[in-house]
Structure formats: C-alpha cells, structure tokens
Interface confidence: medium
Amino acid sequence: APVPPGEDSKDVAAPHRQPLTSSERIDKQIRYILDGISALRKETCNKSNMCESSKEALAENNLNLPKMAEKDGCFQSGFNEETCLVKIITGLLEFEVYLEYLQNRFESSEEQARAVQMSTKVLIQFLQKKAKNLDAITTPDPTTNASLLTKLQAQNQWLQDMTTHLILRSFKEFLQSSLRALRQM
C-alpha cells in the first residue's frame, strides 16, 4: 500500500516545511485515495472486461451510489459551501458500505482496498471538522447497510465484477467532483 499523505519521503526529508493547512490536508487526502482507486481499477480492468462493458446501465440500476447534482450546491452555478460540504460528507458516509463490499474483492490489491477504506474514514473526520452544520449530515442506517451488503455479496460472479467496477468508477468521480468543489471553499 502507498505511504499515507504526510508520511512520504519528501516530508520526512524536509522537517522545516510549514505544516499543511486544513484545506491542503483534505486535498492531499483525496488525492491519496484517488491513487488507491487507480490501482484497484487497474486490477479490476485487467481481470475482466468490465471496463469496456456496455451493460453498465443494467447493473447501475440496482445500485444507489452517491452522485453530485445541481441541487447539492457543489457546482459553480448555485455554489453553496455549507450545502456542498454536507453533501460531500453524506456521500462519503454512504459510500462506506460499498467500500466494505470491496474488501474481499481483490487478490493482489487487498492491502490497497483496505487503505482506501481507512483513508476515507480519515477524510470524513477531516471534513466533519470543517463543517459548521453537523446536524444536517444524515448517517446511513446500519441495518439497511447490513442487508445491502448481504444482497451485494449474494449476486452472481458477473454482477459482482460489474458492481466492483461501478463502485470504483463512481467513487473516483465523486471524489474528483468533491476535490473540484473543495478548492472553491
């Protein structure tokens, strides 16, 4: 697994550097998770032809993956910092069950999958410190998550591969959109 942000050789070699600001830390954390997703996507795409599949829409209908929309306040038109931050945190919390599903889906990148999951938890903590309106953040129901996880794990092999591909792709896109929005804050 890659070295977590703030622990790379450059940072170790340069202790005189100014500490990262909250925004820089969040930025770096997201980019670190995105690197992990890239590695997982590589394994998924090498293992199956899911990345070129045109049947994505069929499987996507069964998943309720978080996605940014105009109303979330994260786009330049109608940008709203607090609404957007709530959306990002809520979305990441909703992704957690899908990241849990990914844990047993990789052979050579098992450690990487764990790193993505743990780094996302850290990112959520960073963002919660930044948010003013924590009451507006809805946490997914654990019972609902547990039954969703069971349902996903009971799918046939093809659907499981497709689900893995879709989760990684959607999570990458959600994070990229978040990165884009957070840089406006």
Epitope: E24, S38, F75, S177, R180, R183
Partner: antibody, heavy 121, light 107 residues
Framework: EVQLVQSGGGLIQPGGSLRLSCAAS????????MIWVRQAPGKGLEWVSD????????YYADSVKGRFTMSRDISKNTVYLQMNSLRAEDTGVYYC??????????????WGRGTLVTVSS | DIVMTQSPSTLSASVGDRVTITCRAS??????LAWYQQKPGRAPKVLIY???TLESGVPSRFSGSGSGTDFTLTISSLQPEDFATYYC?????????FGQGTKLEIK
Amino acid sequence: EVQLVQSGGGLIQPGGSLRLSCAASGFTISSNYMIWVRQAPGKGLEWVSDLYYYAGDTYYADSVKGRFTMSRDISKNTVYLQMNSLRAEDTGVYYCARWADDHNYPHIDVWGRGTLVTVSS
Amino acid sequence: DIVMTQSPSTLSASVGDRVTITCRASQGISSWLAWYQQKPGRAPKVLIYKASTLESGVPSRFSGSGSGTDFTLTISSLQPEDFATYYCAAHYAAPWTFGQGTKLEIK
C-alpha cells in the same frame, strides 16, 4: 489519433452571438474534462470555461459568466461554446482543449488548432 | 483569485545558452503548476506538469522545479526550435490562471 477539430469562428458585430464547435476524435468527451482557452491578439492565454464530464457541471471565468455557455453533445463527441452579447474585448483565438485525466496534477494535454473570433462593427 | 507573475517578460539568448524563467503564485499552489510552450500561430503545448514532471516526448533539456509559490523552468542548452513564448499555469482551482508569458528571442 487523438485530436480536436474546431469550427464556428468569424466576424461578428458587438452584441451578437456565435457558437464555436469542437469535435473530438480518438477519445470520448463523456469521460474527460474539456476546456476553452482564449488569446487576444498579441496577448497571453486566458481560461474561459471548462466542463467536467462526471456531472456535466461547468465553470466560467468572471469575464464571460452569464454571457457564454459551454455544453456538449455526447452522441456527436463534440463540445460547444455559445457566446452571446459579444464585446470587442472578446476578440481573439479560441482554443478548445482537453485536460489530461490525472486527478493528481492535471494539465492540458491536447489542444485544438484554434478558431479566430473578431468582434467589430 | 490566484495571480501568476512570470519574469522576465522578454529574454534574449543564444543557441547553447542555459536559460531560466521564473513564475510566482500569489498564494501557495503546492505543485499544481504546468509550463506551456507556444510558437506564433500555433496552439500551446505542455512541456512540464506537476511542477517538475516532463511530458512524454518533450526533450530532457527542459526541466521544472519549485513548489508552493516559486517555480522555475530551465532550458539547459537552447536549441533553435526553443525560441517561443512560455507560459506557466496554476491548475489548482477555478479560475485556472496563466502567467502573462515570457518571450524567448534570439540575441
């Protein structure tokens, strides 16, 4: 081969409208950041707008916000820049370009050849 | 908005010279910086991104360094085809901003 073919420039009167087109080949716009950059005669480069593939959200420079609209037609693999209420200061070469899909350190890796827009009475 | 200030505006040099162009950001941009080369009547092309990563196909005489607010582009030994205008660009947050350009001309 990855390339961007631009069309739609020309001479237009102040207050007029123009639509620039940028047809992509060798890659799909539905999974790439796309961007418009302009260059006034003898001047430097200025970012105009960009469109993020994921949700189709667009960002605009303050100088064109409310007047220009960037859009895409995925079936034609083409992006557009609709320019309304044109002003003399909008004169220049407009470049359509692609951001390298590198979340870590993005940069513009493919450029169109540019299309000249002249706003004059 | 981030403002990128390039210096010098114009630079006269000879083939074989080592030249350095600097770019300063009005606020820290980490390594979110790219350098572009533009020849008259042509579209720009990327030379360096991530402050110091050479784009594939770009000659190794081009190099970039810096992070935070201060960045440099160095051409170790000028070739005739290097006479052009160079732009730095901050790719950190919209609005994406370019420096005003440095015109490199033959002495």
